[in-house]
Amino acid sequence: TQNKALPENVKYGIVLDAGSSHTSLYIYKWPAEKENDTGVVHQVEECRVKGPGISKFVQKVNEIGIYLTDCMERAREVIPRSQHQETPVYLGATAGMRLLRMESEELADRVLDVVERSLSNYPFDFQGARIITGQEEGAYGWITINYLLGKFSQKTRWFSIVPYETNNQETFGALDLGGASTQVTFVPQNQTIESPDNALQFRLYGKDYNVYTHSFLCYGKDQALWQKLAKDIQVASNEILRDPCFHPGYKKVVNVSDLYKTPCTKRFEMTLPFQQFEIQGIGNYQQCHQSILELFNTSYCPYSQCAFNGIFLPPLQGDFGAFSAFYFVMKFLNLTSEKVSQEKVTEMMKKFCAQPWEEIKTSYAGVKEKYLSEYCFSGTYILSLLLQGYHFTADSWEHIHFIGKIQGSDAGWTLGYMLNLTNMIPAEQPLSTPLSHSTYV
């Protein structure tokens, strides 16, 4: 008799990451009978919603449903119809919406309300849309990468199934860079976390973890650039800003009203004698780096040690996965290799920033000019943030692993968020039944 394949007993989950610059929808899949095993959930699809982040729809909230349609339709196509009604959908909004909420709680609520109504129209099990805290964003990113790296598994292996695995159970730290905020999360070595706001306690798979996390609002790459421009225009003698963070020959007109639109530039706001100014790139890494450092206040620290702006940061410990924009920017700059030292990265950035804008445009013809123009700033900002902000050194640089995906799943907070909300990370180590790891029935 012919062997007949048993129907796949799988489950699906959907998480929408509503970031400051864009929204991405992730579809996850796992075997139903292995829900509590570590490492069984994997990403089957990412759909990047075309357009900006949801906070940009504040003046046209009625269009949020249109904006989300294509990716929600994609989810309907990917997930079997029989599974639709039991597939949970979660939307988490991050720093872009945190900033909108700071400006107007009413407007932020209105955006989320329309998002909820739009997502409720689909045949899935919609579980809600909310603005997650910076602490959650950091924690879930840390859970995601350690789950995917197999760090929560008690079974030690003599072989490595994932990159970066050192066959020990020491967790990786998580470094996440978005457009509007950046998170640092790790388990410090026998160090008390001096500020309670930065301390998290987890019990996962029978093991206790004391985790440090902090989210720096306004220090994502896009908001950091707005901050830098607002700071530098204060001392400009006229409406021309000669900017070392842009390539020589680059020119762009900026509206002062756009510059002061975000809460992140409030501390630099002043009455200027012009409505617009022109950025003129001069492409100098060292000067750009110096300008960025002025965004980090390191003169005040009420703890044994700080990152910047008086925020406690314990001594760095172990390996770190740097993902989201840390990865995208460094990948574009071809600097993600484990073999590239910090000195080499700095050298490459000096050369890249000094390249004329016309040359850059020709070399990267397929890249949107808005993004292309900002890689010099973003790369320099990443170096400044990691070295001066978080106190990585030339030696500890080799402990930073720029990670896009781990085993086919994107590194980021969404997987950890879903694992938590679906109760798929047990506090205790599940008892292994004889069949739970069997490959046949």
Epitope: R48, G51, P52, T69, E369
Partner: antibody
Framework: QVQLLQSGAEVVKPGATVKISCKVS????????VHWVRQRPERGLEWIGK????????KFDPKFQGRLTITADTSTDTAYLELSSLRSEDTAVYYC??????????????WGQGTLLTVSS | DIVLTQSPATLSLSPGQRATISCRAS??????????MNWFQQKPGQPPRLLIY???NQGSGIPARFSGSGSGTDFTLNIHPLESEDFAVYYC?????????FGPGTKLEIK
């Protein structure tokens, strides 16, 4: 500014295959969908299909099944429409178009100038 | 396929007047709380131009005299007051399901 430049007019014989290109400048095609629409002489508009260049998912009118291929090259921001087993009723002006939300949540549309395809023996 | 019917086929009006063009779908083009109906304008020798998307939203740079309304199967494009550059052919298009179909068009001509 955004421009869509299509390849030049084509005169082909029935049964042949044609490949029309649509080169986009000032915009990254990964950030939107590329649609193809045609207009036969003295007739209305006819939607052919679309591609998401970010993941190469395509959707098209089933009546073109088996003879239509829509592709995109994100490195050059160029989309392509390939139509095979051509017949006289495929004679039309073929347009590529982008529509969707920009970075400021404005809904845009950009069109190519059109490519005239003539199928004649 | 969803079939769209437009009326009238031709409309003769003078500048300053109101133009009302109707589009009826063979089945509802509503889904997920959205009406997937778009309106395009086309002038001779030119590509089309998107006027209205999702039944009632104006495309970028479209003058306020163009407005769209309707839901389900019945939709309307209004132009008021008509200007000389508005005389053209107008098409409705549904984007609820593949194949996205266009209506046969309405020719708006100067009286």
């Amino acid at each position: 500014q955004v421009q869509l430049l299509q390849s030049g007019a084509e005169v082909v014989k029935p049964g042949a295959t044609v490949k029309i290109s649509c080169k986009v400048s000032g915009f990254s095609i990964k950030d939107t969908y590329v649609h193809w629409v045609r207009q036969r002489p003295e007739r209305g508009l006819e939607w052919i299909g679309k591609i998401d260049p970010a993941n190469v998912n395509t959707k098209f009118d089933p009546k073109f099944q088996g003879r239509l291929t829509i592709t995109a090259d994100t490195s050059t921001d160029t989309a392509y429409l390939e139509l095979s087993s051509l017949r006289s009723e495929d004679t039309a002006v073929y347009y590529c178009a982008l529509y969707g939300y920009d970075d400021d949540a404005y809904y845009f549309d950009y069109w190519g100038q059109g490519t005239l395809l003539t199928v004649s023996s | 396929d969803i079939v769209l019917t437009q009326s009238p086929a031709t409309l003769s009006l003078s500048p300053g007047q109101r133009a009302t063009i109707s589009c009826r779908a063979s089945e509802s083009v509503d889904n997920y709380g959205i009406s997937f109906m778009n309106w395009f304008q086309q002038k001779p020798g030119q590509p089309p131009r998107l006027l209205i998307y999702a039944a009632s939203n104006q495309g970028s740079g479209i003058p306020a005299r163009f407005s769209g309304s309707g839901s389900g199967t019945d939709f309307t494009l209004n132009i008021h007051p008509l200007e000389s550059e508005d005389f053209a052919v107008y098409y409705c298009q549904q984007s609820k399901e593949v194949p996205y179909t266009f209506g046969p068009g309405t020719k708006l001509e100067i009286k």
